[in-house]
Structure formats: C-alpha cells, structure tokens
C-alpha cells in the first residue's frame, strides 16, 4: 500500500549500554474526537464520512505493523521477520535495545472499511542510539521499584537528571493509556498499591532549527514489600522424627518459605549426619512450588531407593538460607513396628 | 506509626469502640493488625489480630472471642469493638502491627509486633 | 492454647553484668518466639524475632536463643537503660487458635 499519506512521528530511543530496558511504540492512529486524520485529503469539510474512522471502533488489536526496509524493498511484516519485536495489540514491544532498531515502522489497520481508510496509518521513523553523556551517573533505572503502602515516585529516566524547573512537559503513559494529569519529569505517588504495577513510558520533544522529535523511555515498575528482616522458615517437615519401612524407597520434601528480598540468593539443601561426618547430598534441583509479592516458597526433595538400617542412625538435615541467616530441620528415621 | 483513639471512662455492661490509625504505611496484605491490652500494673494480654480485612480473618484470644470484634475499615484505619464491659477490662488498650503473619497447612506464622502505638485507656467504673 | 510461662518473674543485676531470662511454652512452638522490652509508660519494642533474629537497631548485647518448649533470653553487659520489663510471645499455632501469647514478664531492675 501507498505509505505517503500516512503521518509521520520521529522518535529517539537513547539506551543504556549499561543495563537490560525496552521501548514501545504505540500505533496512534488519530481518534475521530481529535482528528479526521485519515479523511483529511479525501473529504472537504462539508462532506459528511459514512462512517467513522477506523478509531471509533475503540478496536485497538486490528492493526498490523510493517517494518520499511532502508534499501527501497517492499514493507515487511513485523511478526514474520523479527522476533526480537512483540505486538500487543496495538503496541509494539522491542524486547532488547541496539542501534539495529533504528529504522521506519508502519503501522495501519488490518481491516480497511472504506477506500478512505487506505491513507489511516502513521509512520515512525525510530532512532536508536547508545547513551553517551557520562555527565548525568546516577540516571533513573528503566526498572524502578516501589514500596507498598509508602509514598513513592517514578522517574523518567532520559530526565531525571534534570531539575523539575529545567524540565520540559512530559507525556505519561502507563499500560499504553494517557495519564493525562501528568505533565513532570516525575510521578509522585502518595500511597502505594500494587495497581501501580506496570510499563510506563514517558514522552517529551526535543527540536532543533530542522525538525523535532519526541524523546521516549520506557520504565518497568514493580511494586514490592521491603525486604525481609526474616530467616526462611522450614515449612515441611515439621517434626524430627519420621516412620519408615525399611527397604521400601521413601521420599522426604523440604518445603522452606522465603520473604521477599530485591537480591534474591534462597539456599536449601540436603545433608545427612553420621556420628562424627557430615555430607551434602545430590538431590533433585529444587522448584518453586508458590510466589507472591511478599514471599516464595521452594521445596527440595531428598530420594532414598531404599531405606536401610544404616540410614536410621542417620539425621538427614534440611538446611535453608537468605541474606539474613540460616535454618535447619533435622529428620531421624524410625522403623515402622507392626 | 499508629495511634489509638477511642478510650474513655464508661459504665459496667457498656460498650465501645476503640480506633487505629496509621500513618506513613497502610494495611496491605503484607501486614496484620493486632490488638494487645495492659491492666494498670500487670502483664501484656494479647486479645486478637486481623490481617486483610474481612471479619473471617480475624482471629482471637480465647477469652476475647464474642465479646471483642476487629475490623479493618480502611486501608488506614482498622476498630475494636467491645460490648458488655466489666471493671476486669480497665486497661491501656495497644494497637500494634506483626510484620509478618502467613498461613501454611494449617498452621498461622507471626513474626512479633515491631510497631506500636502509644496505647488509649479505657475505665470502667460505675 | 498454647501457655508461655516466665522465670523470674523479677531480677536484680549489676551494670556490666549479665542477666538470663527463661520461658517456657506448654507445647513445642519450634524457633516461633518473640522477644519484648516494656519501659514504664511506654509501649513495648520488640528486640528478638523467631528466638534468635536481633530487630535492626537492638544492640547484639541482647541474645535469644532455645527452640521447642525452652527458650532464653541473655543480656550481657548490662546498662542502666536496660533497666525494664521483657515479655516472650509465642508467635505459632493452629489457625484459628489463641497463640499469639504472651508470658507473664520479667523485671530487669539495674544497680
């Protein structure tokens, strides 16, 4: 299709060299409230559209996203050539950042109602560039997090170290939806609640004598518990003794529950006492069996074939740790009578 | 930090509700209210605890149960209710926060109560 | 229910010296044990969680340990502002039941 009608936004995307972020694109195509965009050269004022443009069908999963090849060929379909690039509905997600994203990315409808909605696309022409001003050290993370219940703020990242006076006017959006209440290089959030949860993306324009273009970050917020002043509780087993027939194959699970920590290191192994000696155990990799915001719990299984008298005078020791310290269970085998 | 209101000089067979209030935090699913109580020169006497607001997950001494109702009525503000009064109930009624209670299989897991509030005295005389 | 018993219920001890306080539950309540200091006209302020984990801030003069149905509490180089009342709280139990109780008190009276 013909993409010279469609409208055109430039946008940088400065990344960090130094840590893992995203970007996005939005598909804006004009909503009818704003804008008959995608009538404008079809139709003089007085002429009346049949129907809507494609917007007002508030069907924002129906578009499809083209990539224009710099040498001239055809437009290429995103999903089919680029699996770095995610859609979601009408959002495009760029999973990691380079220079390589650079480049024009189409977007349009997928159902064209009308020979007038062959010209509803927009057309971005995306810039990708490392970061290279040492001057800003302590720049905003592109993953931030926040406290549950406290106060708190997100901060744009290509901005945040600018003074809010220095600060141009910011467009927020978060889960690809228009905050349109904000306009600083910060959010401030009084209180806390996990609904804060989400991708924002920050916006502001940056010209020069020739053009100007709209400067974009992409913030990953989690809200999160503080960490925990806790060692991990062993959940399972709760008692030191265990009843079991000897020769028959017997199976014990460690079930540890640990708080939420940032720098998450859980340890829980297996090792077995006999008089003087002691020794880790190989055992199964250990599985996560629940997580929630506040905590996780992890079990690890020790697998004996069989059970033999030697192993009834041995303790098999549950051992757990995080950054706060240590617990153990021990377990002694008794054989089953009768 | 919390901050108990509520306290008053009331009659035998009265009733009255005792409020919490916090500031700084609010009562999210990670914690759990409590309320303990402290007759005039005797030990601490823990009386129940709720942690996320629906009356079912309340929980309580025994001999507070029936007579004693927690409820959490904001995500800052959480009662304790008291009917049927008697002299035995004149104490400083504390609120405070355990930083971390959970369930497993049957079995509840506290931690300790690391916030306080300063207490709200409660008479009961005729 | 689960019933915390303290000894004793009172203790005299010198500044520098060191004082143990014992408590005691009817019933094994593993390592879920909490430690309070009380000073007159305030409220308590928890020191120990888990019968050995020191709150951030509590000086590491203060120890707990025991686990089951004994637990202690040491407080060595002792100083007048230790000079209060400490209560353990059992911190485990049956859903539903009355656990979360508090032993009786110990007076830390400071010379």
């Known amino acids: 299709f013909n993409i010279s009608g469609c409208s055109t936004k430039k946008l940088l995307w400065t990344y960090s060299t130094r840590s893992e972020e995203e970007f996005v694109l939005f598909c804006d195509l004009p909503e009818p409230q704003k804008s008959h965009f995608c009538h404008r050269n079809r139709l003089s004022p007085k002429q009346v559209p049949e129907h809507l443009p494609f917007m007002g069908s508030n069907d924002l999963s129906d578009v499809q996203w083209y990539q224009q090849p710099s040498n001239g060929d055809p437009l290429e379909d995103i999903r089919k050539s680029y699996p770095h690039i995610i859609q979601d509905k009408c959002t495009l997600h760029f999973l990691t950042p380079g220079v390589n994203n650079s480049g024009s990315y189409i977007c349009r409808p997928k159902m064209i109602k009308s020979p007038y909605d062959v010209a509803c696309c927009v057309k971005m022409i995306l810039e990708v560039k490392p970061q290279t001003n040492a001057s800003c050290e302590y720049s905003a993370s592109h993953k931030q997090d926040l406290l549950l219940g406290s106060t708190g703020s997100i901060s744009c990242p290509s901005l945040s170290c600018q003074s809010d006076a220095q600060s141009p006017a910011v467009t927020w959006y978060k889960n690809g939806k228009l905050l349109s209440v904000e306009r600083s290089n910060r959010i401030v959030v009084d209180e806390v609640y996990d609904y804060h949860q989400g991708t924002y993306v920050c916006d502001y324009t940056q010209s020069d004598t020739v053009s100007s273009w709209t400067v974009r970050a992409v913030v990953q917020v989690r809200t999160i518990v503080g960490d925990t002043k806790l060692k991990p509780d062993i959940l399972d087993p709760v008692e030191d003794t265990l009843e079991v027939e000897l020769g028959k194959p017997l199976t014990i699970s460690c079930k540890a529950r640990f708080g939420f920590e940032r720098v998450f290191n859980p340890v829980i192994k297996w090792y077995i006492k006999d008089s003087d000696l002691e020794w880790e155990v190989s055992v199964p990799e250990a599985k996560s069996i629940k997580s929630t915001l506040k905590d996780e719990i992890i079990e690890r299984n020790i697998i004996l074939e069989k059970v033999t008298q030697r192993d009834l005078r041995r303790k098999f020791v549950c051992f757990v740790q995080n950054s706060i310290g240590n617990t153990t269970q021990s377990v002694q085998l008794k054989e089953k009578r009768g | 930090s919390l901050e108990e209101s509520g306290g008053d000089l009331v009659k035998p067979g009265a009733s009255l509700t005792l409020t919490c209030t916090a500031s700084?935090?609010?009562?999210?699913?990670?914690?759990?209210m409590c309320w303990v109580r402290q007759a005039p020169g005797k030990g601490l006497e823990w009386i129940g605890c709720?942690?996320?607001?629906?009356?079912?997950?309340a929980y309580y001494a025994t001999w507070a149960k029936g007579r004693f109702t927690i409820s959490k009525t904001s995500s800052t503000t959480v009662t304790l209710q008291m009917t049927s009064l008697t002299a035995a109930d004149t104490a400083t009624y504390f609120c405070?926060?355990?930083?971390?209670?959970?369930?497993?299989?049957?079995?509840?897991?506290?931690?300790?109560?690391?916030?306080w509030g300063p207490g709200t005295l409660v008479t009961v005389s005729t | 229910d689960v019933v915390m018993t303290q000894t004793p219920a009172s203790v005299e001890a010198d500044v520098g010296g060191t004082v143990t306080i014992k408590c005691q539950a009817s019933?094994?309540?593993?390592?879920?044990l909490a430690w309070y200091q009380q000073k007159p006209g305030q409220p308590p302020k928890v020191l120990i969680y888990?019968?050995?984990t020191l709150e951030s801030g509590v000086p590491s003069r203060f120890k707990g340990s025991g686990s089951g149905t004994q637990f202690t509490l040491t407080i060595s180089d002792l100083e007048c502002a230790d000079a209060a009342t400490y209560y353990c709280?059992?911190?485990?139990?049956?859903?539903?039941?009355?656990?979360?109780?508090f032993g009786g008190g110990t007076e830390v009276v400071v010379k």
């Open positions: 405070a926060r355990d930083y971390d209670t959970y369930d497993y299989d049957g079995y509840t897991y506290a931690a300790g109560f690391d916030l």
């Open positions: 709280q059992c911190t485990y139990g049956s859903s539903g039941s009355s656990f979360l109780a």
């Open positions: 019933q094994s309540i593993r390592s879920y």
């Open positions: 888990r019968a050995s």
């Open positions: 700084g935090f609010s009562f999210s699913s990670s914690y759990c």
């Open positions: 709720i942690y996320d607001g629906s009356s079912d997950s």
